[in-house]
Amino acid sequence: IFKKEQAMCLEKIQRANELMGFNDSSPGCPGMWDNITCWKPAHVGEMVLVSCPELFRIFNPDQVWETETIGESDFGDSNSLDLSDMGVVSRNCTEDGWSEPFPHYFDACGFDEYESET
């Protein structure tokens, strides 16, 4: 199931790149699958928020994105995330790339990786 989530993530990143006009030489932070959840591409200065993934949720391939961005671009996301919510993890897109997640997954979500036997 997590391989499927990863594949869905890569598809969503590709669609987001098209929407945002991103390519390999674009400044900013590329979308990525960090083995827990999916992060969409972002411009430098943007903060991207994701909610803690439900461990066995199957991605809806019709949903363009499930994250909220604070910054220049906004995709009109279906769920409005806020830094004042619990169970929300953020990353900043800096000139040096993505920051570490804050809070760390284990503190925000109660887990920090999918179990190895799953």
Partner: antibody
Framework: QVQLQQSGPGLVKPSQTLSLTCAIS??????????WNWIRQSPSRGLEWLGR?????????HYAVSVKSRITINPDTSKSQFSLQLNSVTPEDTAVYYC?????????????WGQGTLVTVSS | DIQMTQSPSSLSASVGDRITITCRAS??????LNWYQQKPGKAPKLLIY???MLQSGIPSRFSGSGSGTDFTLTINSLQPEDFATYFC?????????FGPGTKVDIK
């Protein structure tokens, strides 16, 4: 009900290793919903979280930076217990040491504690 | 590390009083905050987790509130067994850090 029973010496010489054990009853050290923590308390430093071990298909540890170079927390699945080792102790490590179970519900919290062990570091 | 401060450091109260203890975090911690009670010679006991969730078995006279950086623990109708020291603890970022404590004694 969950109970944590601590054991270990109350006096350790400077530069030696502090070793404590926490025996778990009413739960398992391999419980995939729990973490197993060590905390200490002294008049000068107050309550200080030292680290934890937990099992999620494999064993993992988190340690406080202040003791990271000196601390080891090990589980013992055969006895359902976990231990603390703190190397190269100094008198500043004198404290009451507690083990505690961590559980998750919106955040991590410590819901069951051992009775505490006063460890004095002195020659 | 996130620094936690508490006020007051001690307070005197009578049975039946309503008391409030304040905890402040040095940075934004959403509601990743726990409260513990400790009596002399004993281990801390969990009262409140996630800022306002009452731990199972804890009397409803205890309540927690707040978010961001400022939090409060309120005890309505203080009982004789409530005279103790109270600690807050942040759980958003390791190392988890505790406040210095508020000692509640009998007036």
């Amino acid at each position: 009900q969950v109970q944590l029973q601590q054991s270990g010496p109350g006096l350790v010489k400077p530069s030696q290793t502090l070793s404590l054990t926490c025996a778990i009853s009413g739960d398992s050290v391999s419980n995939k919903q729990a973490t197993w923590n060590w905390i200490r308390q002294s008049p000068s430093r107050g309550l200080e979280w030292l680290g934890r071990t937990y099992y999620r298909g494999k064993w993992k540890n988190h340690y406080a930076v202040s003791v990271k170079s000196r601390i080891t927390i090990n589980p013992d699945t055969s006895k359902s217990q976990f231990s603390l080792q703190l190397n190269s102790v100094t008198p500043e490590d004198t404290a009451v040491y507690y083990c505690a179970r961590g559980m998750w519900n919106q955040n991590w919290f410590l819901d069951h504690w051992g009775q505490g062990t006063l460890v004095t570091v002195s020659s | 590390d996130i620094q936690m401060t508490q006020s007051p450091s001690s307070l005197s109260a009578s049975v039946g009083d309503r008391i409030t203890i304040t905890c402040r975090a040095s940075q934004y911690i959403v509601r990743y905050l726990n409260w513990y009670q400790q009596k002399p010679g004993k281990a801390p006991k969990l009262l409140i987790y996630a800022a306002n969730m009452l731990q199972s078995g804890i009397p409803s006279r205890f309540s927690g509130s707040g978010s961001g950086t400022d939090f409060t623990l309120t005890i309505n109708s203080l009982q004789p067994e409530d005279f103790a020291t109270y600690f807050c603890q942040q759980a958003i970022n390791q190392p988890y850090t505790f406040g210095p404590g508020t000692k509640v004694d009998i007036k």
